[in-house]
């Protein structure tokens, strides 16, 4: 038994034909010591007396508000609640199972940027005596502050006979750092109450992985002369993080007839333009993809062929266009060519993802991996990557950038990737090793060495392990790499001469 | 299954004309649109232009442009690609391609050889 | 109009090698590029789409990566079947262009 909150206890039961159940002794919460009973919940019925009541709780009708009395006063309340157990696994009646992206999903975040802000929302049938509450941290071992509003009824939705009820919440993380390169995820807990039923459910996610950006906005068509193409142009959302030469999106394009079996144009682009083939009754419409990390596409931003018109209003800084003031010349150190670097690190994105693309949609987070992760560098706060930080002085992020190269080109070479089951010389990871040692050439100025870390003995033995920490490595270079492609577009588009 | 079958190999003379037929089955005709792709012997593919059977809305490729002209009839789900002014260069095989996608080929006619000599 | 090259004009491989063709392309194309596989005397068979988008009834060993202007496409264990002429196609723009072709010829 534990206290959920003040006078609200939880009794942890194994749930099966017959079970013993659980021993509670209550204590009411007085000086008195003598003519104290107690009763449950509405009924009279007196199930003892004494400063203390022990009971025996095997089922709901065990449960409930216990109360302790003295000449018709109420001294103190105990409220019990069951947290079941059956077959090593804990309930999960309340919520309802969304299944996307995998089975087991109660709970589903996302994030507008990386402000640190995010959306929780879950799903159930159940209208009535119902509470929630959700605490967030970022990590579990040495946690730091997020901040979750209150959950509230957000939706709800007629599903055949059934009614289902979406609840969302809000949180922020406290002190967020939307440069840097997550290294401990964000932990929410979710604590549901229905009636004496109580069920907690979590969910353990970085930032990144849960991206889904706004759908572009203003979308406006330009029909071009003599030709049966037409311009469209749109511009970042105003939700998405800024600057844009930093934050940068890539765009899907697409016309098409209200049915989704008909015919179809579609093109890709990293500018907030393109030339399409726009035909009567048809639709243009645009959705938003971070351009460095595989996460969500935006919901798509759409405008009729037939009108050349915007389809929203509002206006606003469009494109990936830099703005602001030139990164100034590094001192004491030279200015790497940003233009070559930006496009080595957006093929490194690429091919971080090709490499083994299944690894974006497999949980790869288990017991110990705080410690796994804990030895490869990643990107921090302090580490001048963020837009102001190169503004200042850059060398200090091309450092942390180069060590990082340096450390992973090692590991893409190291007995875990060249060990069973094999991979061939040319493969994903074999271009992936050769990319990277070409990143940390263009970086490292002539006779210049920066110090690097020394790569962790991780080596396991069996394949299956040295295989899971491949997928485990690649999904944090696919994050390192991500925020290099992030600086060198800055740098490109800010310091480039 | 979606099916294209092209009509048959042609010689003609320089300055002459050649219309090529491409007949459409297994889909509904107005559902894809039709390009017309080429490639002289030993050569690579090039891309001459697409219809809209739907609509009859065309795009050439800027050189057949004022050359070539794409038509397709709905009620014998059959493309037409006419090209007139012949050169020896245009001796090639002229492939028609269905795709519910506009920018990429999916399904090719298995081809008509065209020959263009004096 | 967007230039394509390929490289190399023709590979020599053994049946159960890997290999690797290349794409470039003369500007930034995004993913807006597809794949080909011609035989001889046989009309072209789409392979990929949008860089790496693999098609339905197409062997798995074929598969394909890039953005911008660099692209690939890797057959991982080559089968007897697969040798042939390889195509690379840009849709970015109009006039959609094709590279000149990747030989995958028996070593």
């Known amino acids: 038994i534990w206290e959920l909150k003040k006078d609200v206890y939880v009794v942890e039961l194994d749930w099966y034909p017959d079970a013993p159940g659980e021993m509670v002794v209550l204590t009411c919460d007085t000086p008195e010591e003598d003519g104290i009973t107690w009763t449950l919940d509405q009924s009279s019925e007196v199930l003892g007396s004494g400063k203390t009541l022990t009971i025996q709780v095997k089922e709901f009708g065990d449960a409930g508000q216990y109360t302790c009395h003295k000449g018709g006063e109420v001294l103190s309340h105990s409220l019990l609640l069951l947290h079941k157990k059956e077959d090593g696994i804990w309930s999960t009646d309340i919520l309802k199972d969304q299944k996307e992206p995998k089975n087991k999903t109660f709970l589903r975040c996302e994030a507008k940027n990386y402000s640190g802000r995010f959306t929780c929302w879950w799903l159930t049938t159940i209208s009535t005596d119902l509470t929630f509450s959700v605490k967030s941290s970022r990590g579990s071992s040495d946690p730091q502050g997020v901040t979750c509003g209150a959950a509230t009824l957000s939706a709800e939705r007629v599903r055949g006979d059934n009614k289902e009820y979406e609840y969302s919440v809000e949180c922020q993380e406290d002190s967020a750092c939307p440069a840097a390169e997550e290294s401990l995820p964000i932990e929410v807990m979710v604590d549901a109450v229905h009636k004496l039923k109580y069920e907690n459910y979590t969910s353990s996610f970085f930032i990144r992985d849960i991206i889904k950006p706004d759908p572009p906005k203003n979308l406006q068509l330009k029909p071009l002369k003599n030709s049966r193409q037409v311009e469209v142009s749109w511009e970042y959302p105003d939700t998405w993080s800024t600057p844009h030469s930093y934050f940068s999106l890539t765009f899907c394009v697409q016309v098409q007839g209200k049915s989704k079996r008909e015919k179809k144009d579609r093109a890709f682009t990293d500018k907030t333009s393109a030339t399409v083939i726009c035909r009567k009754n048809a639709s243009i419409s645009v959705r938003a993809q971070d351009r460095y990390y595989s996460s969500s596409w935006s919901e798509w931003a759409s405008v009729p062929c037939s009108g050349s018109g915007s389809s929203r209003g509002g206006s606003g800084s469009g494109g990936s266009g830099g703005g602001g003031s030139k990164l100034r010349a590094v001192p004491g150190g030279s200015s790497p060519a940003w233009t070559q670097c930006q496009q080595l690190s957006q093929k490194l994105c690429t091919l971080a993802w090709s490499a083994h693309p299944l690894v974006g949609h497999m949980d790869l987070r288990e017991e110990g991996d705080e410690e796994t992760t804990n030895d490869v560098p990643h990107i921090q706060c302090g580490d001048g990557c963020d837009p102001q930080g190169l503004r200042d002085n850059s060398q200090f992020c091309l450092q942390r950038i180069h060590q990082g190269l340096i450390f992973y080109e090692k590991l893409l070479g190291s007995d875990i990737f060249t060990g069973e089951p094999s991979l061939l010389p040319d493969s994903p990871v074999g271009q992936l090793h050769a990319s990277l040692l070409g990143l940390s050439q263009l970086l490292q100025p002539e006779g210049h060495h920066w110090e690097t870390q020394q790569i962790p003995s991780l080596s396991p033995s069996q394949p299956w392990q040295r295989l899971l920490l491949r997928f485990k490595i690649l999904r944090s270079l696919q994050a390192f790499v991500a925020v290099a492609a992030r600086v060198f577009a800055h740098g490109a588009a800010t310091l480039s001469p | 299954q979606v099916q294209l079958v092209q009509s048959g190999a042609e010689v003609k003379k320089p300055g002459a004309s050649v219309k090529v037929s491409c007949k459409a089955s297994g889909y509904t005709f107005t559902d894809y649109y039709l390009h017309w792709v080429r490639q002289a012997p030993g050569q690579g593919l090039e891309w001459m232009g697409w219809?809209?059977?739907?609509?009859?809305?065309?795009e050439y490729a800027p050189k057949f442009q004022g050359r070539v002209t794409m038509t397709t009839d709905t009620s014998t789900s059959t493309a037409y690609m006419e090209l007139r002014s012949l050169r020896s260069d245009d001796t090639a095989v002229y492939y028609c391609n269905a795709n519910k996608e506009l920018r990429y080929f999916d399904v090719w006619g298995q081809g008509t050889m065209v020959t263009v000599s004096s | 109009e967007i230039v394509m090259t390929q490289s190399p004009a023709t590979l020599s491989v053994s049946p159960g090698e890997r290999a690797t063709l290349s794409c470039r392309a003369s500007?930034?194309?995004?993913?807006?590029l597809h794949w080909y596989q011609q035989k001889p005397g046989q009309a072209p068979r789409l392979l990929i789409y949008f860089a790496s988008q693999s098609i339905s009834g197409i062997p798995a060993r074929f598969s394909g990566s890039g953005s911008g202007t660099e692209f690939t496409l890797t057959i991982s264990s080559l089968q007897s079947e697969d040798f042939a002429v390889y195509y690379c196609?840009?849709?970015?723009?109009?006039?959609?262009?094709f590279g000149g072709g990747t030989k995958v010829e028996i070593k």
């Open positions: 500007q930034s194309i995004s993913i807006n």
């Open positions: 196609q840009q849709s970015n723009s109009f006039p959609l262009t």
């Open positions: 219809i809209d059977p739907e609509n009859g809305d065309t």
